[in-house]
């Protein structure tokens, strides 16, 4: 008797965060030998069977969750962890602050404000270098994103985006990039 | 216009076996995933069998795998069911489907049913 | 036993506005698969209803309509007419074997 199948993983190459019309390729990785891949779309009942799906041009109704599953025999994996696929640059930017200054003290406090003239409900932060959203528990984003205590490793280059919870796939293009300098 | 229509339904003992066939027209038939869905009489709609478009990719219901084996013949435009060790819970009509399908995307449903086949598994 | 549960019949008089409810699971529904419906007329095929929750195929009118939250979802209709006599079936897809799976179906009936 053989063990469960493991899990496949799913990536978007280069980035999970895509600017409209630009090119991305999802690739769904099991073990050797699988008989079949299949890749969802979630809340949208679409499926292809093919590992890798290539899209020459993103579009806003490409944005959304994603998920895939192999088949070996008759068994099928359990699904991998889901990818969301956002789709960037569908709204304006928004502008990226430092309070009191981007230049600070080893040791001082800081807060980055991501603002937007627009009525958006929801802001992701991204260090330039790191794969996720800064400070992200559970998807939770705000405005302002306080960093206590400052060390040299919060030195670098730091954009936002903002979103509307009701469609959290479509995002607007990156603020303009703001440099930390810890001194 | 679109059209499916299934035929070799009929009486059969059970421990028999019985071929099912689905005819298309009207669409680039090889392009689309298609089901065999089944209704025991006064019952609701059972999934059986579906089978993508090159025939490649197929999965079954547990009540009938390692019975039944679904293929297609898509130079025939043709789908099929072969049903052996037959049961007399098999009894329904069975009607093929299709899944409707977009660009590369297939979905989740079905867009047009053939009008079913009755087989009818009785001593 | 059905994977996805609906109540096995409703009832309305001419006019009036029905509901069919159809609960599903945290593997189908739940994991995020869209529900659609299919009405079933006396002696026929079924036919698709709705696709994608609420989305209504051509031809159909305007007076059925879906929608789906969570694990669950319904069907709607709106203005009850003798035609809209039929068994009416939900439908997903179940994220453990990869299958299609039914409810169980409604009998629709209208009164007088």
């Known amino acids: 008797q053989r063990g469960p199948l493991p899990k496949p993983s799913l990536q978007a190459l280069p980035s999970s965060l895509v600017p409209l019309e630009k090119p991305v390729t999802l690739r769904c990785q099991g073990p050797p030998g699988v008989d079949l891949y299949r890749l969802e779309k979630l809340s949208s009942s679409r499926y292809q069977d093919q590992a890798v799906l290539f899209i020459p041009a993103m579009k806003r109704h490409l944005a959304g969750r994603y998920r895939c599953s192999y088949q070996n025999g008759s068994l099928w994996s359990p699904p991998s962890d889901q990818l969301e696929l956002v789709a960037t640059g569908v709204f304006a930017k928004p502008s990226l602050s430092a309070q009191p200054g981007p230049a600070v003290s080893s040791g001082g406090d800081v807060t980055l404000q991501c603002q937007t003239r627009y009525g958006f409900d929801q802001f992701a932060l991204y260090k330039e270098g790191d794969p996720a959203p800064y400070k992200n528990p559970e998807r939770w984003y705000r405005a302002s994103f306080p960093i206590i205590t400052v060390t040299a490793a919060h030195s670098g280059t730091y954009r936002c985006y903002s979103f509307s919870s009701g469609d959290p796939y479509l995002w607007s293009a990156p603020s303009d990039p703001l440099e930390l300098m810890v001194t | 216009q679109v059209q499916l229509v299934e035929s070799g339904g009929g009486l059969v003992k059970p421990g028999g076996s019985l071929r099912l066939s689905c005819a298309a027209s009207?669409?680039?038939?090889?392009?689309?995933?298609v089901s065999w869905i089944r209704q025991a009489p006064g019952k609701g709609l059972e999934w059986v069998s579906a089978i993508g478009g090159s025939g490649s990719a197929v999965q079954y219901a547990e009540s009938v795998k390692g019975r039944f084996t679904i293929s297609r013949d898509n130079a025939k435009n043709s789908l099929y069911l072969q049903m052996n060790s037959l049961r007399a819970e098999d009894t329904a009509v069975y009607y093929c489907?299709?899944?409707?399908?977009?660009?590369?995307?297939?979905?989740?449903?079905?867009?047009?049913w053939g009008q079913g086949t009755l087989v009818t598994v009785s001593s | 036993q059905s994977v996805l549960t609906q109540p096995p019949s409703v009832s309305g008089a001419p006019g009036q506005r029905v509901t069919i409810s159809c609960t599903g699971s945290s593997s189908n529904i739940g994991a995020g698969y869209d529900v659609h419906w299919y009405q079933q007329l006396p002696g026929t095929a079924p036919k698709l209803l709705i696709y994608?929750?609420?989305n209504r195929p051509s031809g159909v009118p305007d007076r059925f309509s879906g929608s789906k939250s969570g694990t669950s979802a319904s069907l709607a209709i709106t203005g009850l007419q003798a035609e809209d006599e039929a068994d009416y079936y939900c439908q997903s897809h179940d994220l453990g074997a990869h299958v299609w799976v039914f409810g169980g179906g409604t009998k629709l009936t209208v009164l007088g």
């Open positions: 489907a299709r899944h409707y399908r977009e660009f590369r995307w297939h979905y989740y449903y079905f867009d047009y």
């Open positions: 009207g669409f680039s038939f090889g392009d689309y995933y």
């Open positions: 994608g929750n609420s």
